[in-house]
Every structure is written in structure tokens, then in C-alpha cells.
Interface confidence: medium
Amino acid sequence: LPEEDDDTINTDSELRPMKPLHTFCAMKAEDGPCKAMIRSYYFNMNSHQCEEFIYGGCRGNKNRFDTLEECRKTCIPGYKKTTIKTTSGAEKPDFCFLEEDPGICRGFMTRYFYNNQSKQCEQFKYGGCLGNSNNFETLEECRNTCEDGGGSGGGLNDIFEAQKIEWHEGGPPHHHHHHHHHH
């Protein structure tokens, strides 16, 4: 992790106390005035996650990273890349302990969350808005961030099919058959 420097700031959040490593981690994503379409990442102070945005290719600010990993290492305190996981349970971010939260929208994106009961990352259906930070696009990303152990991976959570969104089977009252696609 980068050494803390004079750039450090404090902020409060309902989600958890948060102390970004650098002031630029608190800057808003800035796409800049140019028209290139460069997939980049920034640290979102509100969700406390590194998220994707499209960078225009010029200007912008320091809260811009070429990879998700680079963003996390730079801006998330205590973030450790754990491709080879420790059996001793390395310290994990507080958001790993948040309950699965599909949000209120109905996009039905497949995402992964860390289930503190089973101590495993499991699949859930995310609605596409709101929700919380215990929400990962890939199983590997979830495991690397939140799982402790030297487990073999695999198991029931890989085939976890539960559609736990409370409103999943109902559909909206007046249009049951529309489908729209999210990436």
C-alpha cells in the first residue's frame, strides 16, 4: 500500500467510517473535455468502491486509474490483493459484512456478495441501482476482496441460483413481458 502522506483526509459516512489514503481519491470522476472513450476507474467516496467510468483522454484529475486493482490499492485503506488467500483471515473491508442488497430497481444483473453466514461469496440478482458496496461483478473479485481462507473455491456458491429479490416473481402490475438488457 502507498505510504500515507499529507494528502490524507477524514470523512464520515453512514456506511462506515472512511479515511481515504489521498485527497484525490475524494475527487469526482472527471471525464474531461476530449472525446476519446477510454475505460478507466475512479474511487467513489459515496459507495466506497472503485468504479468504472469513461475518460475522454485529456485533463480530468488524479482520481483516474487504468485498472480496478490500481484504483483499489491506491484509494481503499487496508485493501490487500489476495489471489493466494491466507488461511488466517486477512483483515477484510467492513462492507464485506453488509447484507446482500438488490436495491430498488429491476435490471436483474448477476452480481456476487460475501455471505457472512456461509463465509463464502454467492451470486445474487442486483436491480441496477442503489444497494450497497457488498456487490461485485465477478466471483473472483468478491473472493479476492472478502473471503478469508485457503479454500478450494467452487462448491455450492458457484451454482447459487437463488433469485432473492423480493419482487422478482411478480413483475410490474401493468407490463409483464418487456425485457431490457444491461451490461
Epitope: L130, E166, W167, H180
Partner: antibody, heavy 118, light 113 residues
Framework: EVQLVESGGGLVQPGGSLRLSCAAS????????MSWVRQAPGKGLEWVSA????????YYADSVKGRFTISRDNSKNTLYLQMNSLRAEDTAVYYC???????????WGQGTLVTVSS | QSVLTQPPSLSGAPGQRVTISCTGS?????????VQWYQQLPGTAPKLLIF???NRPSGVPDRFSGSRSGTSASLAITGLQAEDEANYYC????????????FGGGTKLTVLG
């Protein structure tokens, strides 16, 4: 037929409190997330708060966080908004709406006017 | 200052085609979040017109259509009618705010004549 009927609005002094209710009928209330959206006189729409169908997850706009509390009673098919520490800028018509397709609000109530003034 | 930008007003003659634009950024429309459109007739509650970028709820005439591309979206109304005179709002989700459902400032559509 889906119906949402708000009540509880009125005149309140700055710093005061008010509790809005929204009675729902015509759909399976507990299956739907619900939201409050407000509209200041002559202005545009502003999302205020939302709650999941079970009531287990709640969300707030920054402008009301810490002052407003959204809740629901699924046995009564009713949505609530407890508004504390009210300010003049909270003056608006408050609509309740149900979250149906996508990120949309399918159905809206007729609204209830909250006026914060001394 | 609204997160999504709409023209404050537009006008058109009966029978014409009008398009209302809605411009966002990389954290809302550009991040592939759906856009919705609402119609608010004078003195009434908003009504859902388009959801999920281009889907119409039952009962909404096919004169209304929506589209989204990149950081912009638009609502097209063909065969403009007197009863289309209203305020129109676009709405989406913005991930760079603290979980905010966001609206455009609204467009007042006037039907001439």
C-alpha cells in the same frame, strides 16, 4: 386498479416534524419497493427516499439524510415518511410512487403539500 | 442545478414531431443506467411515459418513443396533439452521488395554435 393516496401534509414551523402516510391498494404492496418524490412549488421533481419491499433496505437523498425516515407497514399496505428538523426548503408537494419496471416509478399518488414556514 | 440537463422549453405545432433531449454524464446515462420519461400535465401527478430507455407502459400511445445513446437520451413525440402540452422529465440513476435517483430539470412543451 392501482391507487396510492397520500395524507399528513400541512403547515409546520421550521424545526418541526410531520409524518406523511401513503395508503396503497390494487397491487401486492409487499412485492414492491416504494419511493417518496417531492416537487417544490414551480420547480422540478426531486427523489427523496426509497424502501425495499420487505422494508429491510432504505435509501435517502443527501438533502434529507439524518432528518427523514422512510418506513412501511405491509400488513396495512401503508408507506410512511417521518420528517424531522424541517426547513423552508422542504416545502413541496410530496408524492409516493411504486417502483415497477427498470428504475421507473409506475404509479404515483396525487401528492400532499407540506409547507414549512414561520 | 439538475444532474440531467433538459431544454427548459420547446414548442411545436399540432401534427409536428418534437424531440426533447436529456444529457447526462459518464456516471449516469454513460454508465448504461436506464432512462425513464415522465409526463406531468398541469396540476396533476407525474405519469410514466417511457421506462428502460425505450419501453412504453400499456396505455401510452405509440406516438411517444424513447432512445438512449452514450451520455444522452431523447424523447420523440410524433403527430403532436393539444393534450401533449405538459412538462416532461427524464430520470435515471447516478452512481457517483450517494445512491441517487436523478431527474432532469424538466421541459415545458407548448403546443402552438
Amino acid at each position: 386498479e392501482v391507487q396510492l393516496v397520500e395524507s399528513g401534509g400541512g403547515l409546520v414551523q421550521p424545526g418541526g416534524s410531520l409524518r406523511l402516510s401513503c395508503a396503497a391498494s390494487g397491487f401486492t404492496f409487499s412485492s414492491y419497493a416504494m419511493s417518496w418524490v417531492r416537487q417544490a412549488p414551480g420547480k422540478g421533481l426531486e427523489w427523496v427516499s426509497a424502501i425495499s419491499g420487505s422494508g429491510g433496505s432504505t435509501y435517502y437523498a443527501d438533502s434529507v439524510k439524518g432528518r427523514f425516515t422512510i418506513s412501511r407497514d405491509n400488513s396495512k399496505n401503508t408507506l410512511y415518511l417521518q420528517m424531522n428538523s424541517l426547513r423552508a426548503e422542504d416545502t413541496a408537494v410530496y408524492y409516493c410512487a411504486n417502483n415497477g419496471a427498470a428504475a421507473a416509478w409506475d404509479y404515483w399518488g396525487q401528492g400532499t403539500l407540506v409547507t414549512v414556514s414561520s | 442545478q439538475s444532474v440531467l440537463t433538459q431544454p427548459p422549453s420547446l414548442s411545436g405545432a399540432p401534427g409536428q414531431r418534437v424531440t426533447i433531449s436529456c444529457t447526462g454524464s459518464s456516471s449516469n446515462l454513460g454508465a448504461d443506467y436506464d432512462v425513464q420519461w415522465y409526463q406531468q400535465l398541469p396540476g396533476t401527478a407525474p405519469k410514466l411515459l417511457i421506462f428502460g430507455n425505450n419501453n412504453r407502459p400499456s396505455g401510452v400511445p405509440d406516438r411517444f418513443s424513447g432512445s438512449r445513446s452514450g451520455t444522452s437520451a431523447s424523447l420523440a413525440i410524433t403527430g403532436l396533439q393539444a393534450e401533449d402540452e405538459a412538462n416532461y422529465y427524464c430520470q435515471s440513476y447516478d452512481r457517483s452521488l450517494s445512491g441517487s435517483m436523478v431527474f432532469g430539470g424538466g421541459t415545458k412543451l407548448t403546443v402552438l395554435g
